[in-house]
Interface confidence: medium
């Protein structure tokens, strides 16, 4: 029955780029300007995405496919289909109101996006610092001091600054 009904449904004959117009006896009408249908049998066309502001058009909308956006120079895409744009910074920096600023001592950012976060406090887990942290890298925690063999040394961790809100300008 389902198969028979679909064969009798005139809308199933409407190709991509058209919609089944109920106001015109289910005739296949072309999608209006600034809209598209990417599959056949659609009863409506979808509105084209508009690449405005910090977004720029990578691919124009057509009757069968949506527009695709990327970001203006100095910004990078985030999210599926470039749903957000964020200003470029470097590893070891974060974006502030005054632009990209270096992470302050005791904090790091290992990505080209995002913010500076405090280094891991190894001692909270009863471990010692194996490798010191930098602006670009978190500390690496090693065995607890008690686990170290006699004569072995560990790097003494600097007291982490818990004020990433106050990087040197």
């Amino acid at each position: 029955f389902e198969r028979t009904r679909s064969l009798q449904d005139p809308c199933s004959n409407c190709p991509a780029g058209t919609f089944c117009d109920n106001n015109r006896n289910q005739i296949c009408s072309p999608c209006p300007p600034n809209s598209f249908s990417s599959a056949g049998g659609q009863r409506t066309c979808d509105i084209c995405r508009q690449c405005k502001g910090v977004f720029r058009t990578r691919k124009e909308c057509s009757s069968t496919s949506n527009a695709e956006c990327d970001c203006t120079p100095g910004f990078h895409c985030l999210g599926a289909g470039c749903s957000m744009c964020e200003q470029d910074c470097k590893q070891g920096q974060e974006l502030t109101k005054k632009g990209c600023k270096d992470c302050c001592f005791g904090t790091f950012n290992d990505q080209k996006r995002g913010i500076c976060r405090p280094w891991t406090n190894c001692s909270l887990d009863g471990k010692s610092v194996l490798v010191n942290g930098t602006k670009e890298r978190d500390v690496v925690c090693g065995p607890s001091p008690a686990d170290l063999s006699p004569g072995a040394s560990s790097v003494t961790p600097p007291a982490p600054a818990r004020e990433p809100g106050h990087s040197p300008q």
Epitope: L78, L95, G114, I115, D138, E163, G165, H166
Partner: antibody, heavy 118, light 107 residues
Framework: EVQLVQSGGDLVRPGGSLRLSCTVS????????MHWIRQAPGKKLEWISD????????HYADSVKGRFTVSRDNTKNSLYLQMNNLRADDTAVYYC???????????WGRGTLVTVSS | SSELTQDPAVSVALGQTVRITCQGD??????ASWYQQKPGQAPILLIY???LRPSGIPDRFSGSSSENTASLTVTGAQAEDEGEYYC??????????FGGGTQLTVL
């Protein structure tokens, strides 16, 4: 389509424990910071924890430090919140959220209700 | 930890413009982000960065910033804009803090 599916909410007695889960699909999970944010009934949103892409960098709000533990399994696209020594004021809807840049909470789960009551 | 202060409630006539503000020391350094939340639903990101909207957010929503204040402006408010609006930024320890929320009523 990005989806964050949450589970684990329940009624628990004060002092009890609970583990919340959040499974993510539709995005490269291991690239992004993940967060837990809660909202007590009729109250404002409260950030409680985040975890870095590799799971090594974790941070907590003072209100949950020492009681809650966040973890992630990138092979399962999953985020967890282990909650111990629960108190009545932990009663809230708990949301998981992803942050593309760790700064803005973009995709949110639908939330799961945790009720702490005797 | 830092606090972000919002007016508890504002109202606007249908089609008119309304501004919701958020104040806090952390906003001297960092931009706020803004979220809309409707009853029983998760929040939705409206504005982030200097004045950026995620794809799909109507351009009637805009953001601005000065000194320690961030503002969300809704130009030509619609009935569906009713809800709670939260600002969000960093605190002095690098963690996140939300404002107390502003209930927007569209008359």
């Amino acid at each position: 389509e990005v989806q964050l599916v949450q589970s684990g909410g329940d009624l628990v007695r004060p002092g009890g424990s609970l583990r919340l889960s959040c499974t993510v699909s539709g995005l490269p999970y291991s690239d992004y910071y993940m967060h837990w944010i809660r909202q007590a009934p009729g109250k404002k949103l409260e950030w409680i924890s985040d975890i870095g892409p590799r799971g090594t960098s974790v941070h907590y709000a003072d209100s949950v430090k020492g009681r809650f533990t966040v973890s992630r399994d990138n092979t399962k696209n999953s985020l967890y919140l282990q909650m111990n020594n629960l108190r009545a004021d932990d009663t809230a809807v708990y949301y998981c959220a992803n942050a593309f840049s760790s700064s803005w909470f973009y995709n949110w789960g639908r939330g799961t209700l945790v009720t702490v009551s005797s | 930890s830092s606090e972000l202060t919002q007016d508890p409630a504002v109202s606007v006539a249908l089609g008119q413009t309304v501004r919701i503000t958020c104040q806090g020391d952390s906003l001297r350094r960092y931009y706020a982000s803004w979220y809309q939340q409707k009853p029983g639903q998760a929040p939705i990101l409206l504005i982030y960065g200097k004045d950026l909207r995620p794809s799909g957010i109507p351009d009637r929503f805009s953001g601005s910033s000065s000194e320690n204040t961030a503002s969300l402006t809704v130009t030509g408010a619609q009935a569906e804009d009713e809800g709670e609006y939260y600002c969000n930024s960093r605190d002095s320890s690098g963690n996140w803090v939300f404002g107390g929320g502003t209930q927007l009523t569209v008359l």
